[in-house]
Every structure is written in structure tokens, then in C-alpha cells.
């Protein structure tokens, strides 16, 4: 579920239920955010790459109390292949950069967006 | 309120150019794809090609190459679908509509515009 | 290409009846279908996604089911306003096709 990249000619190949529910629920996220979201709680960033789901949960899962995001981590712990809990960081992590919850979506939202759009949009 | 409002309608000599234009209004312009379809009086709908208005990439039907170019103005919201070396049967009603990733549905679609190819 | 064959091609039933059409893909595209209603001299409106998803706005009347290469756009029963061309598509694969429609008329 990590490799999404590889699009072969002719045509590109739909997500996985798992995934293309992930991707709504970012959707929601973003388009249905009033206040800032998690009272605009702070997370680290990550490098979009390979394993970026676990690297997003990793970073995720550091913010508590925060209902709006909760689905969102519960579906990322679905594509990590290892148990992740708070205070745990990958090599992923750009550890001197933090931005808002709501950007750290609105960015990962953005990248799997564009790897379906890989190979079918020249 | 999400709005796709498209220029009005064209009539064209066969071998001549049309330049659509759709004009979108009540959602982030580059967070969804701008799809062009046409229904040809009497008949089904046909998929034209796609942009992505963020990287302006762009997808087009095999049918539709060489002849097709789709472009966006993200400072004016706007798309453009530009049909080449026009034919008769290219006489149709031209819709822009706009999906999140191609494989969500099409959920709002502009008014349509009739482009009328005759000598 | 991935046709899709929507039968059948015309639909003759009065207000009150149920209406059934069928849509059948020609290879698997999951849940990837779309339906569209369309009435004369108007864009389609959206009415089902992924098959069987319903869209906010959409009378409960109108449903779909299916999965694979055969789905079913089904309304339950059929008041004045749903006499129109109703069409399918795929959404699994480029490029994106249409059914060739069905259109339900009144008896």
C-alpha cells in the first residue's frame, strides 16, 4: 500500500478502498475546517516519501484530545506495518520544522493526490 | 455555491478553431480537475481529457490528440479547451465539469456550450 | 477502453412502477461506477457514486447496487420529474467512458 508510484501505460489504476477513504476523510478535513484545527497544535513535519504513513502517524499521534483528526489516525495506523505510539520518530521526520495540524494535512492531502495523478496527467 | 459557468455558443467553419471557456466560482480552483465532455445532438456523452489546474498537467483521449489542448488560468479560475481542424461532426454540446480525482464522479458540470461546425 | 453497455436502451413504464437499468462493464472496475441523469436541454446531474453511494439532495427513490462488470441503477418508484436519459460511467481507468444511456418514457 506504501508504493504508489509505479502508473503503467495505458491508464492508471484506482485506489484501494482503505486508501481512497483516507483520502475523503483528509477531503473532509480540509474542506469542513472552521476553527483552526486541534487549536492549531503543532506537529513535525515529514519528508512525502516511501513511508510516509507511518512517518504522518508517527507525527499525528502526538497531538491528544483532538476528535477532528482521530479517524485520520486511526486509518494511518492501518497502513503502517508497526505499532506507533506518542514520542516515536522516524528518519522521515524533518525534525527542525513544525507546522500546523491543519497544513500537515492540507500537504499530505496534496502528495497522494498527486501520485494518483502520476502517469495519467503529462 | 459551487458555479462552472462556460462561454456561450459558436459557429465555426469546418477546419477552423473553438476555445471554450469555463469559469469556476465556490471551491479552490487547483484542489479539483477540470473535465471536458460533449454530447453530439441526439447522442451519448464522450470524455474529452482532463486538466489538473495546480501543475497543469494534463490527460487527454486518444481520440481527441493532436487536435485538444486544455489550459487554465488559475488567477481568473478559469479553463479553456481548444478544439483544432474542426469537422461537422464535431458539432456538439461541450461541458466542462470538475473532479477531485478521476476516479471521483463528476459532481458539478458547467451549463454547456453549443458549438455548431458548418459551412 | 472499458465499454460499458446500458440496457435496455429504452424503458416504457408509468409514474408509480418501479424502473431497473442495467449497466455491465466490459472488464472488472470494482466499484468504480458512476450514474447521471439527464434531462432534455440540461448538463447531467450526478445520482450515484461508486456504485451505490447516494448523494445528498437525491430522492431516496433512486438507488444502485453492483460491483465488478454488473450494476443497477433501480427507482423504486417513478414520479413525473424522473422521466429523462440516465447514463453510467467508469471511473477506474482512462479513458473515462459513458454508457450509451437509457432513456425512461412514459408508457
Known amino acids: 500500500l506504501t508504493c504508489l508510484g509505479g502508473f503503467a501505460s495505458p491508464g492508471p489504476v484506482p485506489p484501494s478502498t482503505a486508501l481512497r477513504e483516507l483520502i475523503e476523510e483528509l477531503v473532509n478535513i480540509t474542506q469542513n475546517q472552521k476553527a483552526p484545527l486541534c487549536n492549531g497544535s503543532m506537529v513535525w513535519s515529514i519528508n512525502l516519501t516511501a513511508g510516509m504513513y507511518c512517518a504522518a502517524l508517527e507525527s499525528l499521534i502526538n497531538v491528544s484530545g483532538c476528535s477532528a483528526i482521530e479517524k485520520t489516525q486511526r486509518m494511518l495506523s492501518g497502513f503502517c506495518p508497526h505499532k506507533v505510539s506518542a514520542g516515536q520518530f522516524s528518519s522521515l521526520h524533518v525534525r527542525d520544522t513544525k507546522i500546523e495540524v491543519a497544513q500537515f494535512v492540507k500537504d499530505l492531502l496534496l502528495h497522494l493526490k498527486k501520485l494518483f495523478r502520476e502517469g495519467q496527467f503529462n | 455555491q459551487v458555479q462552472l459557468v462556460q462561454s456561450g455558443a459558436d459557429v465555426k467553419k469546418p477546419g477552423a478553431s473553438v476555445k471554450v471557456s469555463c469559469k469556476a466560482s465556490g471551491y479552490t480552483f487547483i484542489d479539483y480537475e477540470i473535465h471536458w465532455v460533449r454530447q453530439a445532438p441526439g447522442q451519448g456523452l464522450e470524455w474529452m481529457g482532463a486538466?489538473?489546474?495546480?501543475?497543469?498537467?494534463?490527460a487527454y483521449n486518444q481520440k481527441f490528440k493532436g487536435r485538444v489542448t486544455m489550459t487554465t488560468d488559475t488567477s481568473t479560475s478559469t479553463a479553456y479547451m481548444e478544439l483544432r481542424s474542426l469537422r461537422s461532426d464535431d458539432t456538439a454540446v461541450y461541458y466542462c465539469?470538475?473532479?477531485?480525482?478521476?476516479?471521483?464522479?463528476?459532481?458539478?458540470w458547467g451549463q454547456g456550450t453549443l458549438v455548431t461546425v458548418s459551412s | 477502453e472499458i465499454v460499458l453497455t446500458q440496457s435496455p436502451a429504452t424503458l416504457s413504464l408509468s409514474p408509480g412502477e418501479r424502473a431497473t437499468l442495467s449497466c455491465r462493464a466490459s472488464q472488472n472496475i470494482s466499484d468504480y461506477l458512476h450514474w447521471y441523469q439527464q434531462k432534455p436541454g440540461q448538463a447531467p446531474r450526478l445520482l450515484i457514486y461508486?456504485?451505490?453511494q447516494s448523494i445528498s439532495g437525491i430522492p431516496a427513490r433512486f438507488s444502485g447496487s453492483g460491483s465488478g462488470t454488473d450494476f443497477t441503477l433501480t427507482i423504486s418508484s417513478l414520479e413525473p420529474e424522473d422521466f429523462a436519459v440516465y447514463y453510467c460511467?467508469?471511473?477506474?481507468?482512462?479513458?473515462?467512458?459513458f454508457g450509451g444511456g437509457t432513456k425512461v418514457e412514459i408508457k
Open positions: 465539469t470538475r473532479i477531485l480525482l478521476y476516479y471521483y464522479p463528476m459532481d458539478y
Open positions: 461508486y456504485a451505490s
Open positions: 486538466i489538473d489546474p495546480e501543475t497543469g498537467g494534463t
Open positions: 460511467q467508469n471511473g477506474h481507468s482512462f479513458p473515462l467512458t
